[in-house]
């Protein structure tokens, strides 16, 4: 399963038809056309990742499809529309005042997006206000060529940010994961995501989440007390989508945060995470950039032990083996470490309580000229039952005020002759990282020590 190619498309897809969602025009699909597409679904899920340059794993280590390759393939696939949600855009070196050859893949991606617009393929972008890339000109360049861009004022609406990272292509294909539209996400930051091909049911369900952002991106938008019915989802943790992915029986659904952006039927992201944790009986392996059982960006900080308690309860009450891999980089907030030590302190093998925490350090090497890079940005969790791929770090803000999406997938093992289930693939990726020399136990991480690779 290391590198998967998308299927070839035999049929021409009907054009997107703009449809009103109650707040001006929206890039959406007519219900009848949607039904036609769903009959042609042959869903395929491919895990994708970015491995930063100069981060060699042991010879023979498995890997997922390179993210840059997957993104370019998705754009090659596009025939009608590309809808992108991303915290910020920074696809060129000059965006961040850096001259480095590793930005070339991002620049190629920006070029490809401009070519799409030249071929009359519509591009709709929902991005955050506030943002991290205030100097970037990417969106101005794309807007000048006809892209629709909306800055969603999450700072004003929920006191958060739009932190989601996903694409919906032709109402049929999906990318979602940890990577923003940033060249560093392709060559300098470790990322994990999923691409789902030929899956209109799920794509159009995720499109509804995109539409929640889209309508909030108009001037003077307000959060609706109740979302109109056309934003509702019928795919959730109680009624997941069921289908064959490459012949494998699969259930899947998308969750969203914050609750204020969860129309009827949408499972909140936190609820999805807790449900996956709660159903685990053997192990919970999680890889997240940050882990804070507190609020993160609001003053005064509040204690928020929801996820922390769930991990502790799973380990203590059910004997579930918990492994938490947290990132450690130059821009990591060191106040995180006491919480990690506290969690690990629960471990007591004699009492069958197993909690292990490690930090993943990406060596900076000769890339010190690139700010906010050389970090493991992934946000995923895997149990023996399910895979969870998300866009949120683990602290309160990301679930209460900031937008994010999660993908929960469960595949039935044994039904297919070749290839592992998604949760097995994700477990193998986790274990590759966990057992690598870049994953350091907390004992090897002196309090207050910078997250600098010691080799």
């Amino acid at each position: 399963w290391q590198v998967r190619r998308p299927p070839t498309w035999g049929q021409v897809q009907p054009k997107d038809v703009p449809r009103s969602w109650g707040h001006g025009s929206s890039p959406a699909l007519e219900p009848l056309e949607a039904e036609v597409r769903k009959q042609r679904d042959s869903c395929q899920l491919v895990l994708v990742e970015s491995i930063p340059q100069d981060l060699p794993f042991a010879a023979g280590s498995l890997s997922a499809q390179p993210l840059g390759q997957a993104w370019l393939q998705l754009l090659d696939t596009a025939q009608e529309s590309v809808h992108v949600a991303s915290y910020y855009w920074s696809l060129t070196g000059p965006d961040i005042g850096v001259n480095d050859s590793s930005s070339q893949l991002g620049e190629a991606l920006l070029q490809k997006l401009q070519q799409l617009l030249g071929r009359n393929i519509s591009l709709a972008v929902a991005t955050s206000s506030p943002t991290l890339a205030r100097k970037s000109t990417d969106l101005q360049v794309l807007a000048a060529r006809g892209a629709q861009v909306r800055r969603v004022p999450m700072g004003r609406l929920t006191r958060g940010v739009l932190h989601s990272k996903f694409w919906v292509v032709d109402g049929r294909h999906i990318y979602m994961g940890s990577a923003n539209m940033d060249w560093r996400s392709l060559t300098q930051v470790k990322e994990l995501g999923a691409v789902i091909y030929n899956c209109s049911h799920l794509a159009q369900d995720l499109e509804k989440t995109f539409q929640t952002y889209w309508v909030l991106g108009v001037p003077k938008a307000v959060l609706p007390k109740t979302w109109p019915q056309n934003f509702s989802s019928h795919i959730n943790r109680f009624q997941p989508f069921q289908g064959l992915f490459d012949g494998v029986p699969t259930t899947a659904y998308f969750s969203a945060s914050p609750p204020a952006l969860c129309p009827q039927g949408r499972t909140p992201d936190l609820e999805a995470l807790l449900a996956v944790m709660g159903s685990a009986q053997e192990f919970i392996y999680a890889s997240v950039m940050e882990y804070f059982p507190t609020t993160r960006f609001s003053h005064p900080r509040r204690y928020w032990p929801v996820l922390d308690n769930a991990l502790r309860a799973a380990a203590f009450s059910k004997g579930v083996r918990v492994r938490l891999l947290v990132s450690c980089g130059l821009n990591t907030d060191p106040t995180m470490f006491p919480y990690l030590r506290s969690l690990q302190a629960l471990s007591n093998p004699a009492a069958n309580v197993s909690v292990d925490v490690k930090v993943f350090i990406v060596p900076v090497g000769n890339h010190s000229n690139i700010p906010f890079s050389r970090v493991n940005h992934s946000k995923f969790m895997v149990t023996e039952k399910a895979a969870y791929i998300g866009t949120s770090n683990w602290s309160e803000d990301y679930f209460s005020s900031t937008t994010g999406v999660g993908l929960v997938v469960t595949q039935s093992p044994g039904a297919q002759p070749a290839g592992a289930t998604v949760q097995e693939q994700l477990r193998q990726l986790f274990e590759r990282d966990w057992s690598s020399r870049y994953a350091v136990g907390l004992d090897g991480q002196a309090p207050g020590q910078d997250c600098v690779w010691q080799g």
Epitope: P130, G155, E290
Partner: antibody, heavy 124, light 107 residues
């Protein structure tokens, strides 16, 4: 508690260089913040002069052209301002301050800790 | 550079009352605005960041609002210790720029 303290000569002659030190206690200047110099002219106007980042990179106010340099000594946890070719227009109270925090994903930056300031008069 | 203008250089208000200090940017700064308090002894303190968010330890009597180019700081239930000069500052772009300050006095 994080504290910043400015020091340096209170009187500088025109055309000479002004050199100031900011000593930081309670936090490493190699971590998570931009370490800035801000000056306040008589009459209260504040001007951001520039910073040295936690990683040693710099950014300067274009209005100061090529006159300014901000450096650091991480072993002493100090950073420094050097302003060349001063004139009487550079008479001001000079403050050091930290801006950030530059944590992954944080879009909110502010000067959350300031030094008390040191007054520099440029006069012959 | 983005110019920040505080048109009122000084104003006076009564103890227990409230006062609003305004700040205008020369272009849209998309809420990237902070407010600072400078006491008569020169001490500077962050009050509000990103237009309306109270910094740690700042009393809830202080509040901020605004969007686009126009922003304001409101102090309600004025206390003697609020006698100070208040500055706005944009962090939308470099160079960072400050307003000229508004000196608050008690009637």
């Amino acid at each position: 508690d994080v504290q910043l303290q400015e020091s340096g000569p209170g009187l500088v002659k025109p055309s000479q260089s002004l050199s100031l030190t900011c000593s930081v206690t309670g936090y490493s200047i190699s971590s998570h913040y931009y370490w800035s110099w801000i000056r306040q002219f008589p009459g209260n106007r504040l001007e951001w002069m520039g910073y040295i980042s936690y990683d040693g990179s710099n950014n300067y106010n274009p209005s100061l052209k090529n006159r300014i340099s901000i450096t650091r000594d991480t072993s002493k946890n100090q950073f420094f301002l050097k302003l060349n070719s001063v004139t009487t227009e550079d008479t001001a109270t000079y403050n050091c301050a930290r801006e950030g925090p530059l944590y992954y994903g944080n879009p909110y930056w502010y000067f959350d800790v300031w030094g008390a300031g040191t007054t520099v008069t440029v006069s012959s | 550079d983005i110019q920040m203008t505080q048109t009122t250089s000084s104003l006076s208000a009564s103890l227990g009352g409230s006062v609003t200090i305004s700040c205008r940017a020369s272009q849209d700064i998309d809420n990237y605005l902070n407010w600072y308090q400078q006491k008569p002894d020169g001490t500077v303190k962050l009050l509000i960041y990103y237009t309306s968010r109270l910094h740690s330890g700042v009393p809830s009597r202080f509040s901020g609002s605004g969007s686009g180019t126009d922003y304001s700081l409101t102090i309600s239930n004025l206390e003697q210790e609020d006698i100070a000069t208040y500055f706005c500052q944009q962090f939308n772009t470099l160079p960072r720029t400050f307003g000229g300050g508004t000196k608050l006095e008690i009637k």
